[in-house]
Amino acid sequence: YDFTNCDFQKIEADYLRTISKDLITYMSGTKSTDFNNTVSCSNRPHCLTEIQSLTFNPTPRCASLAKEMFARKTKATLALWCPGYSETQINATQAMKKRRKRKVTTNKCLEQVSQLLGLWRRFIRTLLKKQ
Protein backbone atom coordinates (compact mmCIF):
# COMPACT_ATOMS: atom_id res chain seq x y z
CA TYR A 1 0.00 0.00 0.00
CA ASP A 2 1.20 3.52 -0.85
CA PHE A 3 0.78 5.77 2.18
CA THR A 4 1.47 9.00 0.28
CA ASN A 5 -2.16 10.17 0.30
CA CYS A 6 -2.90 9.61 3.99
CA ASP A 7 -4.05 12.46 6.22
CA PHE A 8 -0.86 12.67 8.29
CA GLN A 9 -2.16 15.31 10.70
CA LYS A 10 -5.14 13.14 11.63
CA ILE A 11 -2.92 10.07 12.06
CA GLU A 12 -0.54 12.08 14.23
CA ALA A 13 -3.45 13.23 16.40
CA ASP A 14 -4.69 9.63 16.83
CA TYR A 15 -1.20 8.47 17.72
CA LEU A 16 -0.71 11.16 20.36
CA ARG A 17 -4.20 10.63 21.80
CA THR A 18 -4.32 6.85 22.08
CA ILE A 19 -1.80 4.66 20.23
CA SER A 20 1.24 6.10 22.03
CA LYS A 21 -0.28 5.36 25.42
CA ASP A 22 -0.98 1.74 24.45
CA LEU A 23 2.56 1.28 23.16
CA ILE A 24 3.99 2.70 26.39
CA THR A 25 1.69 0.45 28.45
CA TYR A 26 2.94 -2.58 26.51
CA MET A 27 6.52 -1.50 27.25
CA SER A 28 5.86 -0.79 30.95
CA GLY A 29 8.85 -1.68 33.10
CA THR A 30 11.19 -1.48 30.11
CA LYS A 31 13.32 1.54 29.24
CA SER A 32 13.46 2.48 25.56
CA THR A 33 17.24 2.80 25.97
CA ASP A 34 17.39 -0.95 26.67
CA PHE A 35 17.22 -1.49 22.90
CA ASN A 36 19.31 0.01 20.10
CA ASN A 37 17.57 1.47 17.06
CA THR A 38 17.51 -1.18 14.36
CA VAL A 39 14.97 0.33 11.96
CA SER A 40 14.47 3.86 10.70
CA CYS A 41 12.33 5.85 8.27
CA SER A 42 12.98 8.91 6.15
CA ASN A 43 9.60 10.54 5.53
CA ARG A 44 6.02 10.12 6.68
CA PRO A 45 4.85 7.60 4.04
CA HIS A 46 8.04 5.59 4.61
CA CYS A 47 7.45 5.66 8.39
CA LEU A 48 3.90 4.31 7.93
CA THR A 49 5.20 1.56 5.63
CA GLU A 50 7.69 0.42 8.28
CA ILE A 51 5.13 0.82 11.10
CA GLN A 52 2.66 -1.37 9.20
CA SER A 53 5.31 -3.99 8.56
CA LEU A 54 6.46 -4.20 12.19
CA THR A 55 2.93 -4.11 13.59
CA PHE A 56 1.17 -6.58 11.34
CA ASN A 57 3.79 -8.86 9.76
CA PRO A 58 4.67 -11.83 12.00
CA THR A 59 8.39 -12.42 12.53
CA PRO A 60 10.06 -15.64 13.70
CA ARG A 61 11.05 -14.08 17.02
CA CYS A 62 7.78 -12.26 17.70
CA ALA A 63 4.90 -14.21 16.21
CA SER A 64 2.16 -11.58 16.25
CA LEU A 65 1.49 -8.18 17.69
CA ALA A 66 -1.62 -7.75 15.57
CA LYS A 67 -4.09 -8.51 18.36
CA GLU A 68 -2.57 -6.02 20.80
CA MET A 69 -4.60 -2.91 21.58
CA PHE A 70 -2.09 -0.58 19.95
CA ALA A 71 -2.19 -2.68 16.78
CA ARG A 72 -5.99 -2.64 16.60
CA LYS A 73 -5.97 1.14 17.02
CA THR A 74 -3.20 1.51 14.44
CA LYS A 75 -5.24 -0.51 11.96
CA ALA A 76 -8.36 1.55 12.64
CA THR A 77 -6.41 4.82 12.25
CA LEU A 78 -4.85 3.76 8.94
CA ALA A 79 -8.22 2.55 7.66
CA LEU A 80 -9.82 5.85 8.62
CA TRP A 81 -7.20 8.26 7.28
CA CYS A 82 -5.55 6.41 4.37
CA PRO A 83 -7.84 6.16 1.33
CA GLY A 84 -8.32 2.56 0.20
CA TYR A 85 -6.17 1.12 2.99
CA SER A 86 -8.83 -1.15 4.50
CA GLU A 87 -9.54 -2.82 1.15
CA THR A 88 -5.90 -3.79 0.73
CA GLN A 89 -5.79 -5.37 4.19
CA ILE A 90 -8.79 -7.74 4.00
CA ASN A 91 -6.91 -10.66 2.42
CA ALA A 92 -3.88 -10.20 4.65
CA THR A 93 -6.04 -10.21 7.79
CA GLN A 94 -7.88 -13.40 6.77
CA ALA A 95 -4.57 -15.18 6.14
CA MET A 96 -3.25 -14.08 9.51
CA LYS A 97 -6.32 -15.32 11.41
CA LYS A 98 -5.75 -18.85 10.12
CA ARG A 99 -2.19 -19.16 11.40
CA ARG A 100 -2.33 -17.16 14.64
CA LYS A 101 -1.08 -18.87 17.81
CA ARG A 102 -1.53 -17.79 21.43
CA LYS A 103 0.57 -14.70 22.15
CA VAL A 104 3.28 -14.64 24.79
CA THR A 105 5.08 -11.36 25.47
CA THR A 106 8.74 -12.12 24.84
CA ASN A 107 11.79 -9.90 25.06
CA LYS A 108 11.90 -9.92 21.25
CA CYS A 109 8.35 -8.56 21.13
CA LEU A 110 9.37 -5.84 23.57
CA GLU A 111 12.28 -5.04 21.29
CA GLN A 112 9.96 -4.88 18.29
CA VAL A 113 7.56 -2.54 20.09
CA SER A 114 10.52 -0.38 21.13
CA GLN A 115 11.38 -0.06 17.42
CA LEU A 116 7.74 0.83 16.72
CA LEU A 117 7.90 3.63 19.27
CA GLY A 118 10.99 4.96 17.53
CA LEU A 119 9.28 4.89 14.13
CA TRP A 120 6.22 6.69 15.48
CA ARG A 121 8.45 9.34 17.07
CA ARG A 122 10.07 9.96 13.71
CA PHE A 123 6.64 10.10 12.06
CA ILE A 124 5.30 12.82 14.38
CA ARG A 125 8.24 15.17 13.93
CA THR A 126 7.35 17.16 10.84
CA LEU A 127 10.85 18.57 10.28
CA LEU A 128 14.32 18.24 11.67
CA LYS A 129 15.00 21.32 13.77
CA LYS A 130 17.91 22.15 11.47
CA GLN A 131 19.42 21.05 8.22
Epitope: N37, T38, V39, S40, S42, N43, R125, K130, Q131
Partner: antibody, heavy 122, light 108 residues
Protein backbone atom coordinates in the same frame (compact mmCIF):
# COMPACT_ATOMS: atom_id res chain seq x y z
CA UNK B 1 24.14 -7.11 17.57
CA UNK B 2 24.34 -4.35 14.97
CA UNK B 3 27.41 -4.79 12.82
CA UNK B 4 29.11 -3.43 9.71
CA UNK B 5 32.02 -5.39 8.26
CA UNK B 6 34.13 -3.98 5.46
CA UNK B 7 36.17 -6.07 3.02
CA UNK B 8 38.03 -5.75 -0.27
CA UNK B 9 40.96 -3.60 0.80
CA UNK B 10 44.51 -4.27 -0.31
CA UNK B 11 47.49 -2.95 -2.24
CA UNK B 12 46.82 -1.66 -5.74
CA UNK B 13 48.83 0.25 -8.35
CA UNK B 14 47.95 3.83 -9.32
CA UNK B 15 45.37 3.98 -12.10
CA UNK B 16 43.92 0.58 -11.22
CA UNK B 17 40.55 -0.26 -9.66
CA UNK B 18 39.34 -1.79 -6.42
CA UNK B 19 35.89 -2.69 -5.09
CA UNK B 20 35.09 -2.43 -1.38
CA UNK B 21 32.12 -4.11 0.27
CA UNK B 22 30.35 -3.60 3.57
CA UNK B 23 28.13 -6.34 5.03
CA UNK B 24 25.42 -5.16 7.41
CA UNK B 25 23.68 -7.24 10.07
CA UNK B 26 21.55 -6.76 13.18
CA UNK B 27 19.42 -3.94 11.79
CA UNK B 28 17.01 -3.18 8.95
CA UNK B 29 19.60 -2.10 6.38
CA UNK B 30 17.08 -0.89 3.77
CA UNK B 31 15.84 1.88 6.09
CA UNK B 32 19.18 3.67 6.60
CA UNK B 33 21.34 5.96 4.52
CA UNK B 34 24.90 4.62 4.22
CA UNK B 35 28.24 6.42 3.99
CA UNK B 36 31.83 5.70 3.14
CA UNK B 37 34.36 7.69 5.18
CA UNK B 38 38.14 7.38 4.87
CA UNK B 39 41.17 8.21 6.99
CA UNK B 40 44.65 8.57 5.53
CA UNK B 41 47.49 7.39 7.81
CA UNK B 42 47.97 9.91 10.63
CA UNK B 43 45.25 12.20 9.24
CA UNK B 44 41.66 13.09 10.09
CA UNK B 45 38.34 11.72 8.87
CA UNK B 46 37.31 12.54 5.30
CA UNK B 47 33.82 11.85 4.00
CA UNK B 48 33.76 10.04 0.65
CA UNK B 49 30.18 9.29 -0.41
CA UNK B 50 26.61 8.64 0.74
CA UNK B 51 23.70 6.67 -0.72
CA UNK B 52 20.03 7.07 0.15
CA UNK B 53 18.23 4.33 2.07
CA UNK B 54 16.44 3.28 -1.13
CA UNK B 55 19.52 3.58 -3.34
CA UNK B 56 17.71 6.24 -5.37
CA UNK B 57 20.30 8.97 -4.97
CA UNK B 58 24.03 9.35 -4.28
CA UNK B 59 26.38 12.19 -3.35
CA UNK B 60 30.19 12.35 -3.49
CA UNK B 61 33.08 14.40 -2.16
CA UNK B 62 34.71 16.49 -4.86
CA UNK B 63 37.96 14.56 -4.42
CA UNK B 64 36.39 11.29 -5.66
CA UNK B 65 33.60 12.50 -7.95
CA UNK B 66 33.74 10.77 -11.32
CA UNK B 67 36.12 8.08 -10.07
CA UNK B 68 34.21 6.36 -7.23
CA UNK B 69 30.71 4.87 -7.34
CA UNK B 70 28.65 3.96 -4.26
CA UNK B 71 25.95 1.29 -4.63
CA UNK B 72 23.86 -0.90 -2.36
CA UNK B 73 21.91 -4.15 -2.56
CA UNK B 74 19.10 -4.02 -0.01
CA UNK B 75 18.16 -7.64 -0.68
CA UNK B 76 21.65 -8.75 0.41
CA UNK B 77 22.29 -6.07 3.07
CA UNK B 78 25.46 -4.94 1.34
CA UNK B 79 27.05 -1.60 0.52
CA UNK B 80 29.73 -1.24 -2.16
CA UNK B 81 32.31 1.30 -3.25
CA UNK B 82 33.75 0.91 -6.73
CA UNK B 83 37.03 2.84 -6.88
CA UNK B 84 38.51 3.53 -10.31
CA UNK B 85 41.58 5.50 -11.44
CA UNK B 86 43.11 5.20 -7.99
CA UNK B 87 45.74 7.68 -6.86
CA UNK B 88 48.37 7.63 -4.13
CA UNK B 89 46.27 10.14 -2.15
CA UNK B 90 43.42 7.59 -1.97
CA UNK B 91 45.55 5.51 0.43
CA UNK B 92 43.51 5.27 3.64
CA UNK B 93 41.43 3.14 5.94
CA UNK B 94 37.90 3.08 4.48
CA UNK B 95 34.96 2.88 6.89
CA UNK B 96 31.30 2.31 6.13
CA UNK B 97 28.79 3.93 8.48
CA UNK B 98 25.02 4.01 8.75
CA UNK B 99 22.97 7.17 9.07
CA UNK B 100 19.25 7.71 9.59
CA UNK B 101 17.89 10.25 7.13
CA UNK B 102 14.86 12.52 7.12
CA UNK B 103 13.71 13.66 3.70
CA UNK B 104 17.00 14.62 2.03
CA UNK B 105 18.90 15.26 5.26
CA UNK B 106 21.39 12.76 6.65
CA UNK B 107 21.68 12.56 10.42
CA UNK B 108 24.56 11.35 12.59
CA UNK B 109 26.60 8.23 11.77
CA UNK B 110 25.64 6.03 14.71
CA UNK B 111 27.14 2.68 13.66
CA UNK B 112 30.58 2.25 12.05
CA UNK B 113 32.52 -0.68 10.68
CA UNK B 114 36.09 -1.40 11.76
CA UNK B 115 37.52 -0.33 8.40
CA UNK B 116 39.53 -1.84 5.56
CA UNK B 117 42.95 -0.56 4.45
CA UNK B 118 43.53 0.53 0.86
CA UNK B 119 47.10 1.22 -0.23
CA UNK B 120 47.74 2.77 -3.64
CA UNK B 121 51.41 2.34 -4.52
CA UNK B 122 53.56 1.41 -7.46
CA UNK C 1 33.19 24.67 0.41
CA UNK C 2 32.20 24.76 4.10
CA UNK C 3 35.07 24.45 6.62
CA UNK C 4 34.92 23.33 10.25
CA UNK C 5 37.85 24.46 12.39
CA UNK C 6 38.97 22.58 15.50
CA UNK C 7 42.01 23.17 17.72
CA UNK C 8 44.65 20.48 17.02
CA UNK C 9 45.01 19.63 20.70
CA UNK C 10 43.37 20.18 24.09
CA UNK C 11 44.71 19.11 27.50
CA UNK C 12 42.81 18.47 30.70
CA UNK C 13 43.79 17.39 34.20
CA UNK C 14 42.00 14.29 35.57
CA UNK C 15 38.70 15.25 37.13
CA UNK C 16 38.60 18.61 35.35
CA UNK C 17 36.46 19.80 32.44
CA UNK C 18 37.63 19.78 28.82
CA UNK C 19 36.01 21.89 26.13
CA UNK C 20 36.61 21.19 22.46
CA UNK C 21 35.38 23.78 19.98
CA UNK C 22 34.26 23.50 16.37
CA UNK C 23 34.07 26.75 14.44
CA UNK C 24 32.20 27.49 11.24
CA UNK C 25 30.17 30.28 9.66
CA UNK C 26 26.70 30.22 11.21
CA UNK C 27 27.33 26.69 12.48
CA UNK C 28 24.44 27.27 14.89
CA UNK C 29 22.08 26.75 11.96
CA UNK C 30 23.39 23.21 11.44
CA UNK C 31 22.99 20.06 13.53
CA UNK C 32 26.45 19.18 14.82
CA UNK C 33 27.58 15.63 15.66
CA UNK C 34 30.70 14.62 17.60
CA UNK C 35 32.77 11.43 17.31
CA UNK C 36 35.46 9.95 19.53
CA UNK C 37 38.24 7.90 17.95
CA UNK C 38 40.86 6.00 19.91
CA UNK C 39 44.08 4.78 18.23
CA UNK C 40 43.51 1.84 15.91
CA UNK C 41 39.75 1.92 16.40
CA UNK C 42 36.74 3.11 14.42
CA UNK C 43 35.04 6.39 15.39
CA UNK C 44 32.21 6.27 17.94
CA UNK C 45 29.31 8.73 18.06
CA UNK C 46 29.31 10.58 21.41
CA UNK C 47 26.95 13.54 20.81
CA UNK C 48 24.42 14.10 18.02
CA UNK C 49 22.09 16.94 17.01
CA UNK C 50 24.19 19.47 18.97
CA UNK C 51 23.47 18.15 22.46
CA UNK C 52 21.81 14.71 22.42
CA UNK C 53 23.70 11.70 23.70
CA UNK C 54 23.41 8.05 22.63
CA UNK C 55 22.23 5.83 25.48
CA UNK C 56 25.63 4.13 25.81
CA UNK C 57 27.57 7.40 26.28
CA UNK C 58 28.16 8.69 29.85
CA UNK C 59 26.43 11.89 31.00
CA UNK C 60 29.87 13.49 31.36
CA UNK C 61 29.73 14.15 27.61
CA UNK C 62 27.58 17.09 26.52
CA UNK C 63 27.34 19.50 23.63
CA UNK C 64 26.13 22.95 22.70
CA UNK C 65 25.90 24.94 19.48
CA UNK C 66 25.13 28.57 18.71
CA UNK C 67 26.40 31.37 16.54
CA UNK C 68 29.70 30.39 14.94
CA UNK C 69 30.87 27.82 17.51
CA UNK C 70 29.81 24.33 18.60
CA UNK C 71 31.36 22.92 21.77
CA UNK C 72 31.86 19.41 23.09
CA UNK C 73 32.24 19.43 26.88
CA UNK C 74 33.72 16.50 28.78
CA UNK C 75 33.36 16.89 32.53
CA UNK C 76 35.36 14.98 35.14
CA UNK C 77 37.97 13.98 32.59
CA UNK C 78 39.37 10.45 32.79
CA UNK C 79 42.37 8.73 31.24
CA UNK C 80 39.95 6.70 29.10
CA UNK C 81 38.75 9.89 27.44
CA UNK C 82 42.11 10.35 25.69
CA UNK C 83 41.28 10.21 21.99
CA UNK C 84 40.79 12.24 18.83
CA UNK C 85 37.45 14.07 18.65
CA UNK C 86 35.79 15.15 15.40
CA UNK C 87 32.82 17.41 14.77
CA UNK C 88 30.63 16.83 11.72
CA UNK C 89 27.72 18.47 9.90
CA UNK C 90 25.62 17.73 6.82
CA UNK C 91 25.26 20.66 4.43
CA UNK C 92 21.98 19.91 2.71
CA UNK C 93 22.31 22.78 0.21
CA UNK C 94 25.42 21.22 -1.33
CA UNK C 95 24.67 17.61 -0.33
CA UNK C 96 28.01 17.27 1.44
CA UNK C 97 29.17 15.83 4.75
CA UNK C 98 31.88 17.92 6.40
CA UNK C 99 34.21 16.83 9.21
CA UNK C 100 36.36 19.08 11.36
CA UNK C 101 40.09 18.45 11.31
CA UNK C 102 40.00 16.69 14.68
CA UNK C 103 41.24 17.53 18.17
CA UNK C 104 43.59 15.33 20.18
CA UNK C 105 42.50 15.30 23.82
CA UNK C 106 45.22 14.57 26.35
CA UNK C 107 44.41 13.80 29.98
CA UNK C 108 47.50 14.97 31.88
Amino acid sequence: QMQLVESGGGVVQPGRSLRLSCAASGFTFRTYGMHWVRQAPGKGLEWVAVIWYSGSDTHYADSVKGRFTITRDNSKNTLNLQMNSLRAEDTAVYYCARSPQWEDIFESMDVWGQGTMVTVSS
Amino acid sequence: SYVLTQPPSVSVAPGQTARITCGGNYIGSFSVHWYQQKPGQAPVLVVYDDSDRPSWIPERFSGSNSGNTATLTISRGEAGDEADYYCQIYVSASRLVVFGGGTKLTVL
